[in-house]
């Protein structure tokens, strides 16, 4: 919290930044519709004045819809509900009769559009366990829109993996919903050799879908289990 600092009138001093470390990161991306706050806390004697430039030119209220707000006592400028046209370089110029300093922030305004689900690479991971053991598959989902998660396994019917239509037989083991806790995790307990095979994490939202799979190897009891390397 940096406010104006009163200094002895005899100690004349050119403007200076009160905390240069905080001003090292210059490029900032902000989601559209949010608010941006620029600050350039400074000291000096006499107390410096502050003005703002956008892309090297005087920044005027009429340069953006809704204008902007300034609080000189906090060395700050606020722009509400930013839009892509607010992108640019914002420079605070702090000056008194003994000198002038400036600092530029590079603002990028990003418009977020919903996308199909993204699944973290490498998940679910292949796993192995002994007969009677437990195993857990994890699927990490990133989705703007509400995702629907399904855990699916290829199964056989009457000794066949494929139906008359040529499509594989699939069994939904778990799916997201009110009665399903933590749909991103599929836990298998007391596994048998029949549980071996491919497990698919399928995630969909209203835009699209994505899926990734992992293999479970079930070992005889005398072999030690271990997580396979990718």
């Amino acid at each position: 919290a940096e406010d104006f600092v009163s200094e002895n009138s005899n100690n004349k001093r050119a403007p200076y930044w009160t905390n240069t470390e905080k001003m090292e990161k210059r490029l900032h991306a902000v989601p559209a519709a949010n608010t941006v706050k620029f600050r350039c806390p400074a000291g000096g004697n006499p107390m410096p004045t502050m003005r703002w430039l956008k892309n090297g030119k005087e920044f005027k209220q009429e340069h953006r819809i809704g204008g902007y707000k300034v609080r000189n006592q906090h060395w700050s400028l606020i722009m509400e509900s930013v839009v892509p046209s607010d992108k640019g370089n914002y420079t605070c110029v702090v000056e008194n009769e003994y000198g002038s300093i400036n600092h530029t922030y590079h603002l990028d305004v990003v418009e977020r559009s919903p996308h199909r689900p993204i699944l973290q690479a490498g998940l679910p991971a292949n796993a192995s366990t002994v007969v009677g053991g437990d195993v857990e598959f994890v699927c990490k989902v990133y989705s703007d829109a509400q995702p629907h998660i399904q855990w699916i396994k290829h199964v056989e019917k009457n000794g066949s993996k494929y139906g008359p239509d040529g499509l594989p037989y699939l069994k939904v083991l778990k799916h997201s919903g009110i009665n399903s806790s933590n749909a991103e995790v599929l836990a298998l307990f007391n596994v048998t050799e029949a549980d071996a095979g491919e497990y698919i994490c399928k995630v969909s939202n209203y835009i699209g879908q994505a899926n990734q799979s992992a293999w479970l190897t079930v070992l005889p009891k005398q072999q030690a289990p271990g997580r396979e390397k990718e």
């Epitope: 919290a1 905080k22 900032h28 989601p31 620029f38 906090h74 700050s76």
Partner: antibody
Framework: EVQLVESGGGLVQPGGSLRLSCAAS????????ISWVRQAPGKGLEWVGR????????NYADSVKGRFTISADTSKNTAYLQMNSLRAEDTAVYYC????????????????????WGQGTLVTVSS | DIQMTQSPSSLSASVGDRVTITCRAS??????LAWYKQKPGKAPKLLIY???FLYSGVPSRFSGSGSGTDFTLTISSLQPEDFATYYC?????????FGQGTKVEIK
């Protein structure tokens, strides 16, 4: 005009579950966030949690962590508060509020401000 | 958690009075402080954000000041519609926390 309408409140037994909905209109849903705030009868405001509608990230108060889940369906412009393992002390009016970020580029953190609120829905946990 | 303490808890005032409510944070919250107004049976309304910025549509008789740990909400000339409960709220720390509220009543 920005509007938020909560629904789903009611009477539930301790240990039970309830899902509250917050239907939003009048703004670009994925640009900002939704917070849930509750107010026990005759008491002050308590922040419950928040979701950022763009990336789906969530934050929760310690008092509800592990029991409550905030989610959103952007196709329906609706946010949800799934409340499990409910306790008597969860009895309150629950508000949803549009939440935008003030991105302070100097200190590199985001201040969250709740600018539009729903009318609230009452949740009573009692046997 | 950051504790927010408001004072006074309640006050009685008349229309036209100048009213000041203070809010103290248990640790530095910089300028990350908002003020809300709530009438009985209604949802809160945002008045001030970032300690001193007036939210759009809020009358100019409301003002906020302060930084760090000490903050003030001032109503320069109290109007009949201003009788309500006022809450401060910080969001620099997790979790966001509210003050206990200050009830402004008619004298």
């Amino acid at each position: 005009e920005v509007q938020l309408v909560e629904s789903g409140g009611g009477l539930v037994q301790p240990g039970g579950s309830l899902r509250l909905s917050c239907a939003a209109s009048g703004f670009t849903f994925t640009s900002t966030g939704i917070s849930w705030v509750r107010q026990a009868p005759g008491k002050g405001l308590e922040w419950v949690g928040r979701t950022h509608l763009g990336d789906g990230s969530t934050n929760y108060a310690d008092s509800v962590k592990g029991r409550f889940t905030i989610s959103a369906d952007t196709s329906k412009n609706t946010a949800y508060l799934q409340m499990n393992s409910l306790r008597a002390e969860d009895t309150a009016v629950y508000y949803c509020a549009r939440t935008y970020g003030i991105y302070d580029l100097y200190v590199d953190y985001t201040e969250y401000v709740m600018d539009y609120w729903g009318q609230g829905t009452l949740v009573t946990v009692s046997s | 958690d950051i504790q927010m303490t408001q004072s006074p808890s309640s006050l009685s005032a008349s229309v036209g009075d100048r009213v000041t409510i203070t809010c103290r944070a248990s640790q530095d919250v910089d300028t990350s402080l908002a003020w809300y107004k709530q009438k009985p049976g209604k949802a809160p309304k945002l008045l001030i954000y970032s300690a001193s910025f007036l939210y759009s549509g809020v009358p100019s008789r409301f003002s906020g000041s302060g930084s760090g740990t000490d903050f003030t909400l001032t109503i320069s000339s109290l109007q009949p519609e201003d009788f309500a409960t006022y809450y401060c709220q910080q969001s620099t720390g997790h979790p966001q926390t509210f003050g206990q509220g200050t009830k402004v009543e008619i004298k």
